[in-house]
Interface confidence: low
């Protein structure tokens, strides 16, 4: 055996010295395909003459008389050397164009060559092979292709990557899926399906390295193909918007003198679009800054928001302006596949201030007066003044924001509370200001789990109206797992506000929940019968923090308080 | 991004010479077969020549052989197509393209193109 | 050198019509034929390769077929965007050679 290995050996070195004196057509080292494959995995790698370098397949060549000759050079070493197809169970072997590691071995790293030729004709191409190991948790240094997924957009899918051709369509291989170390299954969004899997809903929380397990037998032995994708949630096409400059605006004018520096941001949002080029320029005068000449710096910052929305910001800067410069027209472009904009900077000369000591004076006196009256007006009448303004020019804000509900409200479940919450607080919210309030032991269908209906509502709700008293406390009440889920929506998304009322004093309290609520919360106080006062500050307290809503019965409670019928029966 | 960009077209007389430039980004110029196209005002595609990645080997149209000679500074990043003794019927618009697949004959990418006017 | 013949040479179609341009080799090219489409004053585009490959990024209503002499690109249902002229290119030998172009017009 080793004497025909030596044999075989001298025969290829022959080729390679006849090829040298002959000419051979290489086509170098295809660094463009880096492959890399796993130790103690199968590998099949393609000779890429065929794929990229010449117009005629493998068969056409074969059938032609060309003979396709394979052989290495290890790692570090400049001998090229024959690939000894003679190991034990065939790891190597060839097929027709492929070249066949079953499985591979660490020490297989190399550049590998694979030449056609025959007696007149020689073309050859030599491609890097790197066998890399992986831990336990698929963790390598291999390069991971990156799979995008839009956000909120249906169901979308992935493909376990590269398994094409590992084995013929009658075997069925058992195809396991892992999000970075842990197997998937019984996720919510994410379900596997064979060589695919499946995102019901791609959200932030599924960006990550996904791998496929691919398992298969052949020859009484099982083999194992791992495949690792990175996946990245991006901005979804439905909410691409054309590129929005937010500087230069109207609302800035750039004031200079001559000499001073002219510094102007042209900030630019654009949404992620797949394939997208997003450009940002500026023209001065309509010209290209380069195709004047002012001396002009343009330097440009790039950031990416977690769905790959861009922000460029590129500042203009011309070191000492003059007066010629501050009347040119500079003009912000921005363009994406979605559609182009562009932005004038308001740049003005700075006129001299004139001198005007006593007038100056008393200016001043007036304006500070003005301030201190406005100050103490503001502290005595601030509620009227923010629900005035609120009632005026606030913004719905619950227009399109997903919720159901206004208010989720938490209470003890006694006859005391429980009055205070149907009666009071609910006549007045629902009926009198137009707010939508759940209330669990209402609006709950009967037979559904508690802790996920309460979850639910809390989700779908805007404000989180704790009503506080003694009876709120006590350790493991329906109250407190609603006190904890709010808390914990506010503080890790935001998307919920916690409301503290307090219905009778509570005194010193072990539930952490509550202290740390207490500390960072404003709390109402109910002050009983001098509460249900119409203009009382506790219904005005409690409708600044409410959500503000446009509603058709809000009409003149915002400016009067309350009218007095909506409590006469409380 | 893959671009290609041609200037160096213009106005110039019968039996004058010009030299296009074509300059390339966003990919490894010395890996593709580069190749001038030209289109007659109003008329189809021609194509005029290519030049392998090492610039060993040219081809060209029958009807610019001797004249138009074809090269490349994979360096620089650039193709060149130096036009001498031209005439009226070689008034087009030039364009670079970039061979698929290292030298496949396809063309995967194109330049803006840049007019060629021979005209007395 | 070989010739290209395409027909027609201008096609009037409407929008979702299936349409499907012809083009002819002079002698036989096995599959060593692409197919690009060209909007006026632009550079054309690479629509098909090696007969019936598609370009990557080309929309899937586009496809081609033939081999030896016989080729034909087919759109499945017109787009506002498709109506362009469309050129055959044969690679099999130098010169590389164009089809004489088909213009594809609204009805």
């Known amino acids: 055996m080793t004497l025909l290995w030596c044999v075989v050996s001298l025969y290829f070195y022959g080729i390679l010295q006849s090829d040298a004196s002959e000419r051979c057509d290489d086509w170098g080292l295809d660094t463009m395909r880096q492959i890399q494959v796993f130790e103690d995995e199968p590998a099949r790698i393609k000779c890429p003459l065929f794929e990229h370098f010449l117009k005629f397949n493998y068969s056409t060549a074969h059938s032609a008389g060309l003979t396709l000759i394979w052989y290495w050079t290890r790692q570090d070493r400049d001998l090229e050397e024959p690939i000894n197809f003679r190991l034990p169970e065939n790891r190597i072997s060839k097929e027709k164009d492929v070249l066949w590691f079953r499985p591979t071995l660490l020490n297989d790293t190399g550049n590998y060559t694979c030449m056609l030729r025959n007696t007149t004709y020689c073309s050859k191409v030599a491609f890097p092979l790197e066998v890399v190991q992986k831990d336990s948790c698929f963790n390598s240094p291999m390069k991971l292709p990156v799979h995008k997924l839009y956000i909120e957009y249906g169901i979308q899918r992935i493909t376990c990557p590269n398994v094409d051709g590992y084995f013929p369509s009658s075997v069925k291989p058992t195809i396991t899926w892992y999000m970075g170390c842990y197997k998937i299954q019984n996720f919510n969004n994410v379900i596997p399906e064979g060589m695919n899997l499946s995102f019901l809903i791609a959200l932030i929380s599924n960006n990550g390295n996904y791998t496929c397990v691919v398992t298969y037998p052949e020859n009484g032995r099982t083999f194992h193909l791992t495949r690792t994708l990175t996946v990245k949630v991006v901005g979804s096409p439905k909410n691409a918007v054309p590129p929005v400059i937010h500087s230069p605006n109207d609302h800035v004018v750039y004031e200079k003198e001559p000499g001073e520096e002219l510094l102007i941001p042209c900030t630019v949002y654009f949404s992620f679009l797949m394939d997208s080029r997003n450009e940002v320029w500026w023209t001065i005068d309509g010209k290209k800054p380069d195709d004047i000449t002012i001396d002009v710096t343009i330097n440009e910052s790039i950031s990416h928001s977690r769905t790959e929305d861009e922000t460029r910001t590129q500042i203009l800067s011309i070191k000492k302006v003059t007066s010629e410069d501050l009347k040119r027209s500079y003009v912000c472009h921005a363009r994406s596949a979605k559609g182009e904009v562009a932005k004038a900077a308001k740049v003005k000369q700075k006129v001299p201030a004139p001198r005007y000591t006593v007038e100056l004076a008393c200016g001043f006196g007036a304006t500070v007066l003005l301030v201190v009256i406005l100050i103490v007006v503001y502290h005595v009448y601030w509620l009227e003044m923010v629900l005035f303004y609120r009632a005026h020019f606030g913004t719905d804000e619950t227009i399109l924001d997903g919720k159901e509900y206004d208010i989720y409200v938490s209470y003890a479940r006694n006859a005391e509370e429980e009055e205070f919450v149907l009666l009071t607080l609910r006549g007045v919210l629902e009926n009198e200001f137009g707010y939508k309030l759940c209330i669990f032991d209402r609006d709950s269908l009967p037979g559904g789990i508690v802790t996920d209906e309460t979850l639910s509502f809390i989700q779908k709700s805007r404000r989180l109206l704790v009503v506080l008293s003694p009876n709120y406390v006590l350790q493991g009440t329906q109250a407190l797992l609603e006190l904890k889920a709010g808390l914990e929506n506010m503080a890790s998304r935001g998307n919920i506000n916690v409301i503290l009322v307090q219905y009778k004093a509570v005194k010193e309290t072990k539930v952490k929940e509550l202290k740390r609520a207490k500390t960072v919360l404003t709390v109402i106080k109910w002050k009983g019968e001098k509460s249900k006062y119409p203009q009382g500050r506790f219904w005005k307290q409690l409708q600044v923090a409410m959500p503000v809503k446009k509603s058709p019965r809000r009409s003149s409670s915002d400016e009067q308080g309350l009218s007095y019928s909506s409590l006469k029966n409380v | 991004e893959v671009q290609l960009v041609e200037s160096g077209g213009g106005l110039v007389q019968p039996g004058g010479s010009l030299r296009l430039s074509c300059a390339a980004s966003?990919?490894?110029?010395?890996?593709?077969?580069m190749t001038w196209v030209r289109q007659a005002p109003g008329k189809g595609l021609e194509w005029v020549a290519n030049?392998?990645?090492?610039?060993?080997?040219?081809n060209f149209v029958d009807s610019v052989k001797g004249r138009f000679t074809i090269s490349r500074d994979n360096a620089k990043k650039s193709v060149f197509l130096q036009m001498n003794s031209l005439r009226a019927e070689d008034t087009a618009v030039y364009y670079c393209?970039?061979?698929?697949?290292f030298g496949s004959g396809y063309f995967d990418y194109w330049g803006q193109g840049t007019l060629v006017t021979v005209s007395s | 050198d070989i010739q290209m013949t395409q027909s027609p040479s201008t096609l009037s179609a409407s929008v979702g019509d299936r349409v499907t341009i012809t083009c002819r080799a002079s002698?036989?090219?096995?599959?060593?034929l692409a197919w690009y489409q060209q909007k006026p004053g632009k550079a054309p585009k690479l629509l098909i390769y090696?007969?019936?490959s598609l370009e990557s990024g080309v929309p899937s209503r586009f496809s081609g077929s033939g081999s030896g002499t016989e080729f034909t690109l087919t759109i499945s249902s017109l787009q506002p965007d498709d109506f362009a002229t469309y050129y055959c290119?044969?690679?099999?030998?130098?010169?590389?050679?164009f089809g004489q172009g088909t213009k594809l017009e609204i009805k």
């Open positions: 002698q036989s090219i096995n599959s060593w």
């Open positions: 030049i392998k990645q090492d610039g060993n080997e040219k």
């Open positions: 290119q044969q690679y099999n030998s130098y010169p590389h050679t």
């Open positions: 966003g990919f490894t110029l010395s890996f593709y077969w």
């Open positions: 090696k007969a019936s």
């Open positions: 393209a970039r061979e698929g697949y």
